[in-house]
């Protein structure tokens, strides 16, 4: 039988997406211009390379990392690219409106593209919890709401807590994880009889998911150092992230083997756990003074990630309807929290050392920032979940969850493609 989009979605999606794109083009026309200053070209190339690393992480890394479902791999990769492209456009405008707009025009620089790519990455992390259960029209809504929520969170944190680019962007892990989990909680959960095979992983898609993990692993130092303002900070961030992800790989593979009764290694554990160190070290990557500390953090993060992958999927599947292989949400929620806690511990150690009330005040501010990030993530995630449940989006029927054939044209239409 021929698989097509439902007729209503065929009308709704192109109209919705293209109208939105036209609106974005108009906004860019009226409100933006390029930075006209003459730059040192060598500096320009170096600056572009960081943005390129982030784009590779987003498009290839997160795109392929989510592609391990047996019958939903095409959609995972392509929908990720779609969301990235849309998210970057909206994030550039939003960041400009929130930070630059009093001057009348939003100036687009390579740095603003860098910020926008990182904001869009948030959506790609969150969407892991709902991919396969939503169509593109719903994903457009998710992109718009999440990028807007993150942009406003960053602005509020900047203004209230006086937090710089790096620190307020590093809430992305916790924000994206809790946003995604709360959206998933709102969506129809039980998988009907006969679709259990679709959310299982297959060898070739699992290999492409591993490829995604490798790209993320390679470029995570660029992500953690992208918004730091001095060469010394960036150098330390790169080194510490590298040591942390290196140790988390070793921990992930050996920990996965340890967690299995026959000592076998789980692909799913490895996909996510290899990144554990990078997430855990993110907030304080520039503050860690020596490799051994970063390595200890990588070890702890790897163990938490493998432990989480072993014990949390059952709970997440029951409560949130998240399949066993979509473990980025709870993984990042645990590791993001670990990263934030590490930063707070550093501040607490300062307080103990200095006996300074002002540092104690900074500890409270940091706890406030983290709490605000979680609250806004949960609230905006629930709002998004409720929006996605509206009938107008023509969500895929539960029987069509995790099925590429609902969205893609396959010449042969074989079940085992």
């Amino acid at each position: 039988m021929s698989s097509k989009y439902p007729r209503s979605v065929r009308r709704c999606l192109p109209l919705w997406a293209l109208t939105l794109e036209a609106a974005l083009i108009l906004l860019f026309y009226f409100f933006t211009h390029y930075d006209a200053s003459l730059e040192d070209q060598k500096g320009l190339v170096a600056s572009y390379q960081v943005g390129q690393d982030l784009t590779v992480m987003a498009a290839i890394g997160l795109g392929f990392l989510t592609s391990s479902f047996r019958r939903h791999s095409w959609s995972s990769v392509a929908f990720n690219l779609f969301m990235l492209a849309l998210g970057v456009q909206w994030a550039i405008l939003l960041d400009g409106f929130l930070s630059q707009f009093p001057s009348g025009k939003v100036v687009i620089t390579l740095f603003s593209i860098r910020l926008a790519t990182m904001s869009a990455l948030s959506v790609l992390i969150s969407v892991d919890a709902v991919l396969g259960k939503v169509n593109l029209a719903q994903l457009v809504v998710m992109v718009l709401v999440e990028v807007t929520a993150l942009g406003n969170l960053r602005m509020v944190i900047s203004n209230i807590f006086n937090t710089d680019y790096h620190m307020n962007m590093m809430h992305i892990y916790v924000f994206a994880a809790y946003f995604g989990l709360s959206v998933a909680w709102c969506l129809p959960k039980p998988l009907p009889e006969g679709t259990e095979d679709k959310d299982q992983t297959a060898t070739i898609p699992s290999l492409s998911a591993m490829l995604g993990a490798l790209f993320l692993w390679m470029f995570w130092p660029s992500f953690n150092s992208a918004l730091l303002r001095s060469p010394i900070e960036r150098k330390n961030a790169v080194f510490n992230t590298y040591y942390a992800v290196a140790v988390s790989v070793v921990t992930a593979i050996s920990g996965s083997s340890l967690a299995h009764p026959q000592g076998k290694i789980s692909k799913t554990y490895v996909h996510s756990a290899v990144l554990a160190g990078g997430v855990a070290v993110g907030t304080s990557c520039h503050l860690i003074p020596s490799p051994w500390l970063a390595m200890v953090l990588g070890l702890v993060a790897g163990l938490i990630s493998v432990g989480g992958a072993k014990y949390l999927p059952g709970c997440c599947n029951r409560v949130l309807g998240i399949p066993h292989s979509s473990i980025m949400g709870y993984n990042f929620s645990l590791l993001g929290l670990l990263g934030e806690i590490i930063y707070i511990v550093l501040l607490v150690l300062d307080t103990v050392g200095a006996g300074n009330g002002m540092i104690g005040f900074q500890v409270l501010l940091s706890i406030g920032e983290l709490s605000l990030a979680i609250v806004i993530a949960l609230m905006s995630g629930l709002l998004t979940g409720l929006l996605l449940n509206l009938k107008i989006w023509k969500a895929p029927h539960e029987a069509k969850y995790f099925d590429d054939q609902v969205f893609w044209k396959f010449p042969h239409l074989a079940v085992g493609f």
């Epitope: 620089t109 900047s158 006086n162 307020n168 060469p231």
Partner: antibody, heavy 129, light 111 residues
Framework: QVQLVESGGGVVQPGRSLRLSCAAS????????MHWVRQAPGKGLEWVAV????????NYADSVKGRFTISRDNSKNTLYLQMNSLRAEDTAVYYC??????????????????????WGQGTTVTVSS | QTVVTQEPSLTVSPGGTVTLTCASS?????????PNWFQQKPGQAPRALIY???NKHSWTPARFSGSLLGGKAALTLSGVQPEDEAEYYC???????????FGGGTILTVL
């Protein structure tokens, strides 16, 4: 020794443009952020703009945003300030200053230092009809 | 609009001690504002004295010290010399807005 020399100041009519330069010597210019600071006659110091060491990010005071553009050419060890749509209130001595880079570390964390350390002697800009 | 406030003027006797303060309209000043202090004499460019709350430059005389006092940044001059007569500016970093803001300056008179 470390030195910053500003140039390009002068008398200009309101609404016109002017470009200031700051030539740096005695240090590795490409690894330092740079600032422009101004001081109106008989007034205090006012921070104008900053550019990161690699030119990737620029930030401006609200009073000049949209009119002034900070840039740098690391191959020429030079910092620039392009001033457009000049107003009478932009009359001031303009200083370039080097962004401070420093840190110390304890066994468990690094502490970074921010600020400005080296200043030029300034160049005077007068906006008058 | 963020405002950084300093005492407009202070007078001190030679050999005495004086403390200049720097407050932010956004609330308590913490080390996260990286308070800097500068000295400017008439007709000269500003000269950096203190950075990141309490750190001295190699050229800063030992009698100058920086600290945080009751939610404000403070510059203390102990054993004031006649040549310390100048205008002193504090500078705070607002990381969230990526802005630096100078205080209005304190004119220190040594009588």
């Amino acid at each position: 020794q470390v030195q910053l020399v500003e140039s390009g100041g002068g008398v200009v009519q309101p609404g016109r443009s002017l470009r200031l330069s700051c030539a740096a010597s005695g240090f590795t210019f490409s690894t330092y952020g740079m600032h422009w600071v101004r001081q109106a006659p008989g007034k205090g110091l006012e921070w104008v703009a900053v550019i990161w060491y690699d030119g990737s990010n620029k930030n401006y005071a609200d009073s000049v945003k949209g009119r002034f553009t900070i840039s740098r050419d690391n191959s020429k060890n030079t910092l620039y300030l392009q001033m457009n749509s000049l107003r009478a209130e932009d009359t001031a001595v303009y200083y370039c200053a080097r962004d401070l880079q420093g840190y110390r570390s304890s066994w468990y964390r690094m502490y970074y230092y921010y600020g400005m350390d080296v200043w030029g002697q300034g160049t005077t800009v007068t906006v008058s009809s | 609009q963020t405002v950084v406030t300093q005492e407009p003027s202070l007078t001190v006797s030679p050999g005495g001690t004086v403390t200049l303060t720097c407050a932010s309209s956004t609330g308590a000043v913490t080390s996260g504002y990286y308070p800097n202090w500068f000295q400017q004499k008439p007709g000269q460019a500003p000269r950096a004295l203190i950075y990141s709350t309490s750190n001295k430059h190699s050229w800063t005389p030992a009698r100058f010290s920086g600290s945080l006092l009751g939610g404000k940044a403070a510059l203390t001059l102990s054993g004031v010399q006649p040549e310390d007569e100048a205008e002193y500016y504090c500078l705070l970093y607002y990381g969230g807005a990526q802005r630096w803001v100078f205080g209005g300056g304190t004119i220190l008179t040594v009588l």
